[in-house]
């Protein structure tokens, strides 16, 4: 029988603490045993649970991808917090990867928001002040601007 084949309670490390569920639930940092009788602690740095639960195993800790920095490590009650490296951002609609921020705004637009780990630079039309959304323009259309210098 391989380690993988064994049920969770047979794989539990000797040092994993056990306690009794409260109204069928185990506290954050724990999961419930298959028979529902015990709460078993998550393994620090490997898995976690954030809420009272009746999960049969804790949740696997996220590993930060290349291109990401680890803001805070995984604990038994909180997942790893990863953030895009400087100059890149993660959009809500494509959370699986960090994308490069645009280096500047299209002609006729001015930068009003910087690149952050969660948003691209923000561009608005000079005259109307309306936001520009969409893909980065072709390189020859791009006008770069440094802070304090309006785009020409």
């Amino acid at each position: 029988i391989t380690q993988q084949d064994l049920a969770p309670q047979q794989r539990a490390a000797p040092q994993q603490k056990r306690s009794s569920p409260s109204e069928g639930l185990c506290p954050p940092g724990h999961h419930i045993s298959e028979d529902g009788r015990d709460c078993i602690s998550c393994k620090y740095g490997q898995d976690y649970s954030t809420h009272w639960n009746d999960l049969l195993f804790c949740l696997r800790c996220t590993r930060c991808d290349s291109g990401e920095v680890e803001l805070s490590p995984c604990t038994t009650t909180r997942n790893t917090v990863c953030q895009c490296e400087e100059g890149t951002f993660r959009e809500e609609d494509s959370p699986e990867m960090c994308r490069k921020c645009r280096t500047g705004c299209p002609r006729g637009m001015v930068k009003v928001g910087d690149c952050t780990p969660w948003s691209d630079i923000e561009c608005v039309h000079k005259e109307s002040g309306t936001k520009h959304s969409g893909e980065a323009p072709a390189v020859e259309e791009t006008v770069t601007s440094s802070p304090g210098t309006p785009a020409s």
Epitope: I1, Q4, D5, L6, A7, P8, Q9, Q10, R11, G24, I32, E34, D35, G36, D47, N53, D54, L55, L56, F57, L59, R60
Partner: antibody, heavy 117, light 110 residues
């Protein structure tokens, strides 16, 4: 390693029926086992599971209608009071634990139960 | 009770093509989703467990993705042998949550 269901037959409504899943090549003390059924021409329907320690859990719709139990080499599914809607092929499946997930990786060929008056 | 909604119910594609099947859970099931292939007269065969991990012997043309409540099975470089019905299932992960199956998707290979 294998699992095989038996006990499927034609029964009249209300007549209790027990299906047996016989396993070989592995120990039931190390694996959870599920029962799943499939009505003719229909999809798969999960009935319940018995854990490696013998604790049973049932689908919401199946509670009271089925009872799962086990010995060292068999897992039984008792259909307490069959109706015509229980006509189906019944499968048992071994649940493998992958560290952060279970999955039914080893299935029997199924046994057909027909409930008719 | 947990409900798994699978779409489409049937899909047709040519040999060499790509098929995408969606599965939606009525509540958060984290990454506890499995995909099965079933051919007439046979028991289901496990393809993918824990959302995206390939079961032993399953070709890499099969891939799974998603988390929480939205999941996808993709079959690329479709072969004639892929003609079957595919089911998603919320795998056992909680003592109070049903291991419900989706309604199935019939894949027809042209």
């Amino acid at each position: 390693q294998s699992v095989e269901e038996s006990g499927g037959r034609l029964v009249t409504p209300g007549t209790p029926l027990t299906l047996t899943c016989t396993v070989s090549g592995f120990s039931l003390s190390n694996y959870a086992m599920s029962w799943v059924r499939q009505a003719p021409g229909k999809g798969l329907e999960w009935i319940g599971i018995i854990s490696s320690s013998g604790t049973t859990y049932y689908a919401s719709w199946a509670k009271g209608r089925f009872t799962i139990s086990k010995t060292s080499t068999t897992v039984d599914l008792k259909v307490t009071s069959p109706t015509t809607e229980d006509t189906a092929t019944y499968f048992c499946a071994r649940e493998t634990y992958y560290g952060y997930s279970y999955a039914a990786g080893l299935w029997g060929p199924g046994t057909l139960v027909t409930v008719s008056s | 009770a947990l409900v798994m909604t699978q779409t489409p119910s049937s899909v047709s594609a040519a040999v060499g093509g790509t098929v995408t099947i969606n599965c939606q859970a009525s509540q958060n099931i984290y990454s506890n989703l499995a995909w099965f292939q079933q051919k007439p007269g046979q028991p289901p065969k496990l393809l993918i467990y824990e959302t995206s991990k390939l079961a032993s012997g399953v070709p890499s043309r099969f891939s799974g993705s998603g988390s929480g409540t939205e999941f996808t099975l993709t079959i690329s470089d479709l072969e004639c042998d892929d003609a079957a019905t595919y089911y998603c299932q919320s795998s056992w992960h909680s003592i109070s949550t049903d291991c419900a199956f989706g309604g199935g998707t019939e894949v027809v290979v042209k």
